[in-house]
């Protein structure tokens, strides 16, 4: 007799019920809520992972998608050789072939066309008789010495084709193009049942004020360091080495108190060029103090360590470190469903589940 | 050495009103961002407001925004947080913060509690 519910107290423990189940709900579709921030110092590779997340998971790039991006190739291409053509005079290196002075003349009177996103049979002539020029090839052997884009040779020892009329960029040369990031950049994808919010804020100083907005419950920062800037000459602005203000940068942000419970990912990445490099620079350029050999395996296992022991909270605190060449999609592919897992594993311990 | 500290928390009853002060020193403060960060009991950080060097522009979350005024002296290297119409959801460990924009250099104090219960 006393067990009975009155209708109102029965509607009170249906509510109840409700909201349990909507903070399950709230808690469950949180937990599958991913927040990444991508960091890294300029030029490490961080937009190119931007772009291969669209190729991975989200279909790629439409025709339509890579014919804009026609203009961006063929102003890579032509900065690039240009870069080249100008260190040239820096380097006091000659042509090879006397007659290329004028096509470098004639390269600077062309250039502005091909911006548009047309090149002629003209420029790319006399761009193809330029990058032949066993001058200008010794220059770009010296590239360390000054700035130049690392899809520079990819461009350039493919002009026939990127100067035909009817070139359409592929998926690679989208993902090899080099566009300055200013602001924030956010991406979102489905993976494993997990829904990513990437940022990648990689922004110049100017656009840094909005930063602080995507510090705060951030499950991942994905770390990008080029390994191949290791043997970089400083240019005059420059007060360190490119490697070891990335160090810098990445003990800021690996210590900071924004980043307490957040799962921290180092891409070491460039790996191609990097294993190319360390064939011909040795790392005392960087690190004067190495005593080991020249090798792919042992140089990069120096820097991982350089790397991983800025972290002063290595008894709670693991850094995930992977190899990557963030222009290949199929290890970008893989090293990113090892991260997945790691989230996955890092959001059970979270809820008590692991 | 850089040194940020905090004062004026304390408790308060829902509604009422609280300033929050940073001093700051060891650093060029005109040349950072100022935040105020909170982290209520058992939660994670949560950014609660910016003020910029240069244009001295202000931003504030959702959930103080109307209710909460930041402003900074330059010339006492201080930062203010002016609280009105507070909730129980504003109690928390309140962090002032510097931040030169590239996470180089990011600089905190050690806290000041504010906690709203009638």
């Known amino acids: 007799m006393g067990c009975t519910l009155s209708a109102e107290d029965k509607a009170a423990v249906e509510r109840s019920k409700m909201i349990d189940r909507n903070l399950r709900e709230d808690g469950e579709k949180a937990a599958r809520e991913v927040k990444l921030l991508l960091l890294g110092a300029g030029e490490s590779g961080k937009s190119t992972i931007v772009k291969q997340m669209k190729i991975i998971h989200e279909a790629g790039y439409s025709e339509e998608e890579c014919k804009q991006y026609k203009a961006v190739v063929y102003s890579n291409t032509i900065q690039s050789i240009i870069a080249i053509i100008r260190a040239m005079g820096r380097l006091k290196i000659d042509f090879g072939d006397s007659a290329r002075a004028d096509d470098a003349r004639q390269l600077f009177v062309l250039a502005g066309a091909a911006e548009e996103g047309f090149m002629t049979a003209e420029l790319a002539g006399v761009i193809k008789r330029l990058w032949k020029d066993s001058g200008v090839q010794a220059c770009f052997n010296r590239s360390r010495e000054y700035q130049l884009n690392d899809s520079a040779a990819y461009y350039l020892n493919d002009l026939d084709r990127i100067a035909q009329p009817n070139y359409i960029p592929t998926q690679q040369d989208v993902l090899r193009t080099r566009v300055k990031t200013t602001g924030i950049v956010e991406t979102h994808f489905t993976f494993k049942d997990l829904h990513f919010k990437m940022f990648d804020v990689g922004g110049q100083r100017s656009e840094r004020k909005k930063w602080i907005h995507c510090f705060e419950g951030v499950t991942a920062i994905i770390f990008c360091v080029a390994l191949s800037d290791y043997d970089l000459v400083l240019a005059e602005d420059e007060e360190m080495n490119r490697m070891h203000e990335s160090m810098k940068l990445f003990d800021s942000i690996c210590n900071n108190k924004w980043f307490t419970d957040t799962s921290i990912i180092l891409f070491l990445n460039k790996k191609d060029l990097f294993e190319e490099k360390i064939k011909k620079s040795p790392l005392t350029i960087c690190y004067p103090e190495y005593a080991g050999s020249n090798t792919y395996e042992e140089a990069a296992a120096y820097i991982q360590c350089q790397f991983e022991d800025l972290n002063k909270r290595k008894d709670t605190k693991e850094i995930y470190t992977h190899f990557t060449c963030a222009t290949d999609t199929k290890n970008v592919q893989f090293v990113f469903d090892a991260v997945t897992d790691v989230i996955i594993k890092n959001n059970l311990k979270d809820c008590g589940l692991f | 050495e850089v040194q940020l500290v905090e004062s004026g928390g304390g408790l308060v009853q829902p509604g009422g009103s609280l300033r929050l002060s940073c001093a700051a020193s060891?650093?060029?403060?005109?040349?950072?961002?100022m935040n105020w960060v909170r982290q209520a009991p058992g939660k994670g950080l949560e950014w609660v407001s910016s003020i910029y060097n240069g244009d001295g522009d202000t931003d504030y979350s959702d959930s103080v925004k109307g209710r909460f005024t930041i402003s900074r002296d330059n010339a006492k290297n201080t930062v203010y947080l002016e609280m009105s119409d507070l909730k129980v959801q504003d109690t928390a460990i309140y962090y002032c913060?510097?931040?030169?924009?590239?996470?180089?250099?990011?600089?905190w104090g050690q806290g000041t509690q504010v906690t709203v219960s009638s």
């Open positions: 913060n510097a931040y030169d924009g590239t996470l180089l250099r990011d600089y």
């Open positions: 060891g650093f060029t403060f005109s040349s950072y961002y």
